[in-house]
Interface confidence: low
């Protein structure tokens, strides 16, 4: 039994760290392996995580952790029975992957705009609550070439979108992900998509027919 790609771990910096690794052959992760983890601090308890299979040779462990502070370092040991396969350390504050933003909704707003809203996945008392910036991806469900990416660098989890920037009568989907710049985090996973019909009509369509120009 041998580790092909050693464990790499990310923390949501509030309650959970997730480690993933790849074995050199298909492995029943939960039956054959255990990941032990312990906060590198006097008197800290040793915990054991039972991994699950993500693919036939890729294992994933989700570890409950206390509300992390920057200096926290965990000692990790990967075991196959009595055999130590890998040993390493993990500092959650250096490997942050934010939680996924939630409850993405789209609302018609004044002046032919759509208001996209979502929820910050962190409570206000958490360090990351005020650190998140977002990326919103808006795509035409029937035209893969028609997509837009918006970086939301201000605090509020909202985006105003002019309906005129989207094709009239087309169905669009949006999804959002988060990033914590000061922690040099990775991006969160994408939120589930929300879909809506862009029923805005360009103003030219209301002109008398002989004034209506087609642009090619």
């Amino acid at each position: 039994v041998k580790v092909l790609h050693e464990p790499s771990c990310f923390s949501d910096y509030i309650s959970t760290s997730v480690c993933q690794w790849k074995m050199d052959h298909p492995t029943n992760c939960s039956a054959e392996l255990r990941l032990s983890y312990q906060l590198d601090f006097m008197g800290s308890e040793n915990h054991t995580c039972v991994p699950e299979n993500r693919e036939d040779s890729v294992c994933v462990c989700s570890m409950p952790i206390d509300d992390a502070v920057e200096a926290d370092v965990y000692q990790l040991d990967l075991w196959a029975g009595q055999q130590l396969l890998w040993s390493g350390s993990f500092q959650p504050s250096k490997h942050v992957k934010p939680r996924t933003p939630g409850n993405l909704t789209v609302h018609p707003n004044i002046s032919h705009t759509w208001l996209l809203m979502w929820t910050n996945p962190y409570p206000t008392e958490n360090h990351l609550h005020s650190e998140l910036t977002y990326m919103v991806n808006v795509s035409n469900d029937n035209d893969p070439e028609d997509f837009k990416v918006y970086n939301v660098t201000y605090m509020g989890p909202t985006l105003r979108l002019a309906a005129s920037t989207l094709k009239s009568g087309a169905s669009y989907s949006a999804r959002v992900r988060a990033w914590a710049q000061t922690y040099n985090s990775t991006w969160s996973d994408w939120s589930p998509s929300t879909t809506w019909l862009n029923y805005y009509e360009p103003w030219e369509q209301h002109l008398p027919h002989h004034h209506h120009h087609h642009h090619h």
Partner: antibody
Framework: QVHLKESGPGLVAPSQSLSITCTVS????????VSWVRQPPGEGLEWLGV???????YFHSALISRLSISKDDSKSQVFLKLNSLQTDDTATYYC?????????????????WGQGTSVTVSS | DIVMSQSPSSLTVSVGEKVTMSCKSS????????????LAWYQQKPGQSPKLLIY???TRESGVPDRFTGSGSGTDFTLTISSVRAEDLAVYYC?????????FGGGTKLEIK
Amino acid sequence: QVHLKESGPGLVAPSQSLSITCTVSGFSLTSYGVSWVRQPPGEGLEWLGVIWGDGSTYFHSALISRLSISKDDSKSQVFLKLNSLQTDDTATYYCAKQGTIYDGYYNYAMDYWGQGTSVTVSS
Amino acid sequence: DIVMSQSPSSLTVSVGEKVTMSCKSSQNLLYGGNQKNYLAWYQQKPGQSPKLLIYWASTRESGVPDRFTGSGSGTDFTLTISSVRAEDLAVYYCQQYYDYPYTFGGGTKLEIK
């Protein structure tokens, strides 16, 4: 200074076995893996197999039945043995060190290579 | 086994020109655990052993001139030489180390006009 050097017989008769030794310096075989790669004349590179610091081995799927790789850590030597040679085993055989640990993850690229030893399979 | 395909098989350029060569993998080489692509590029000059140029698809090996750049992710990768020099005459190979058995592409032979 990392150095690898292959030594082989040069000429081997068909159906016989090929044995090549790779002698290394500048790193420990208990810490790093060594791969074997061959190159038929005028052709590309073909990975044959690897032996890791803990002694575990992995082989090219087409050669698994007739290839073995072993080592002597104390002598800093890695050994390749290929059985039942055919003419299409004619090639230059290289040993190469598997790369160092970088940025917290394993780098399995081959960062140092020997100069190669030419092997001809012919009667 | 993961199949690596390189194109073109050969190309001829003048000194100072920019060169790009392609490497495609039959399987994804991006490992989700660390967001790294397990792909290397090697240079083999005539009569010499291969030399490591790039690993992790885009990280230059120490001592390799910065005119060599690796890019790409997943299954499509590119090696670019920004301004070819006469000493770059060689065959360039890509290699995946995502899974066993490690496999090489067939090589791209760079010739100088």
